[in-house]
Interface confidence: medium
């Protein structure tokens, strides 16, 4: 019985198409596959950012794979050929590993890269990113932002920078068509006559950084002699009602009765005739059914109801 062996894939490489972190891993079939013409060869691919404890593992019949990486760090990947048990009279055969790495040669010291990068997708409509210049960089340093997401032909540069003292410190993005629920890649690089500037890479999904507008049209309705219903409306904009959680803060005279998270646009209180004044404010956030994370809106305008007028249904703003 001769031992069955198979070679690793050939020409294994990581290709950077210029999408700011979305990379292609590609390879060619192994040499000497002639003995296994009747077989469908598979490949086991493992890859990770250098420094990560866990490998991502993919088994595929294709000769390529695409995924997103953090280009602030290097990338390592390895692949081997798998011959299924059907081809080898009963036991799976694996080749040795072919390995490759990829990294962008860093320019400049880490302190020169942008600091405190912060991106907010206002009301699921307008993306705005802001940053602070690197530590110790001179005023001649300028930063440029590039972005890409699946659907764009190539990475685009920001066309509407926010400036302070002549330096770019933020970007107002144009309308981003079909850009949510997918990775959004950003690179902020820089230039200076004085010294090289380190680039920074960021990846997020837009639906997870939404800051909605606050709820509107806050009202009180007396449901019965001892019940008052607080109501409000979803903020204007594209976010559907099913995507909201609310936090409501209710004050009675000088005391905060409740700060509670609610899923609907109503909240009911049982009151007594002694209540002199009720006030409430509400804020909104995208909920777990529509995103993995989000940012609370600002608080709504306060709506108050004077206790003396509770029976008369007088509203105060």
């Amino acid at each position: 019985d001769t031992e069955i062996k198979v070679n690793p894939p050939q020409d294994f490489e990581i290709v950077d198409p210029g999408y700011l972190g979305y990379l292609y891993l590609q390879w060619q079939p192994p040499l000497s596959l002639d003995h296994f013409k009747e077989c469908t060869v598979e490949y086991e691919l493992k890859y990770r950012n250098i420094g990560s404890e866990t490998w991502k593992t993919i088994i595929t019949k294709n000769l390529h794979y695409k995924d997103g990486f953090d280009l602030n760090k290097g990338i390592e990947a390895k692949i081997h050929t798998l011959l299924p048990w059907q081809c080898t009279n009963g036991s799976e055969v694996q080749s040795s590993w072919a390995e490759t790495t990829y990294w962008i040669s860093p320019q400049g010291i880490p302190e020169t890269k942008v600091q405190d990068m912060d991106c907010v997708y206002y009301n699921w409509q307008y993306l705005l990113c802001s940053w602070k210049p690197g530590i110790g960089v001179l005023l001649d340093t300028n930063y440029n932002l590039f972005y890409w997401y699946e659907g764009l032909d190539h990475a685009l540069q920001c066309v509407d920078y926010i400036k302070a003292d002549g330096q770019n410190i933020g970007c107002r993005f144009p309308y981003l068509e079909a850009s949510d629920y997918k990775d959004f890649y950003i690179c902020v690089n820089g230039s200076s006559e004085n010294k090289p500037i380190r680039s920074s890479y960021f990846t997020f999904q837009l639906q997870n950084i939404v800051k909605p507008l606050p709820p509107v049209y806050l009202t009180f309705t007396r449901e019965s002699s001892c019940e008052i219903k607080l109501k409000w409306s979803i903020p204007l904009g594209p976010i559907p009602a099913r995507c909201f959680d609310y936090e409501i803060e209710i004050r009675e005279d000088d005391t905060t009765l409740v700060t509670a998270t609610v899923e609907n646009e109503t909240y009911t209180l049982k009151t007594t005739n002694e209540t002199r004044q009720l006030c409430f404010v509400v804020r909104s956030k995208v909920n777990i059914y529509c995103s993995d994370d989000g940012i609370w809106s600002e608080w709504s305008d306060k709506q108050c109801w004077e206790g003396e007028d509770l029976s008369k249904k007088t509203l105060l703003r």
Epitope: E252, D254, T255, T256, L257, K270, T271, T272, T275
Partner: nanobody, 121 residues
């Protein structure tokens, strides 16, 4: 100093009842309100109910119609009557003062040490 001591927790069957108590000291109880929060393992703190000095009560949908909060000013004690208990009511329950700008009430929220409520089928 403001002090809250909560008690009455324990185990109950689904559909059963428990009554929690919270005795306060260190401030004028009758001039202030009281509330309860709860926290289940691995979950965020959740508001359960509150009652103001005027008797205004508020309940989220998750407990409305099943839980009732009341005050006994003579005993400086608040009570939380929990009926028709569900598995998802399992948590540590904390009684709390209500933050107030009034001079006779605590300015910030104080909590009791908590009491475990376990509901099983």
């Amino acid at each position: 100093a403001v002090q809250l001591v909560d008690s009455g927790g324990g185990s109950a069957q689904v559909g059963g009842s428990l009554k929690l108590s919270c005795t306060a000291s260190g401030y004028i109880f009758s001039s202030c309100g009281m509330g309860w929060y709860r926290q289940a393992p691995g979950k965020k703190r959740e508001f359960v109910t509150s009652v103001s000095k005027y008797g205004t009560t508020t309940y989220p949908d998750s407990v409305k119609g099943r839980f009732t909060i009341s005050l006994d000013n003579a005993k400086n004690t608040a009570y939380l009557q929990m009926n028709s208990l569900k598995i998802e009511d399992t948590a540590v329950y904390y009684c709390t003062t209500l933050a107030s700008r009034g001079t006779t009430c605590p300015a910030s929220v104080y909590s009791g040490p908590g009491t475990q409520v376990t509901v099983s089928s």
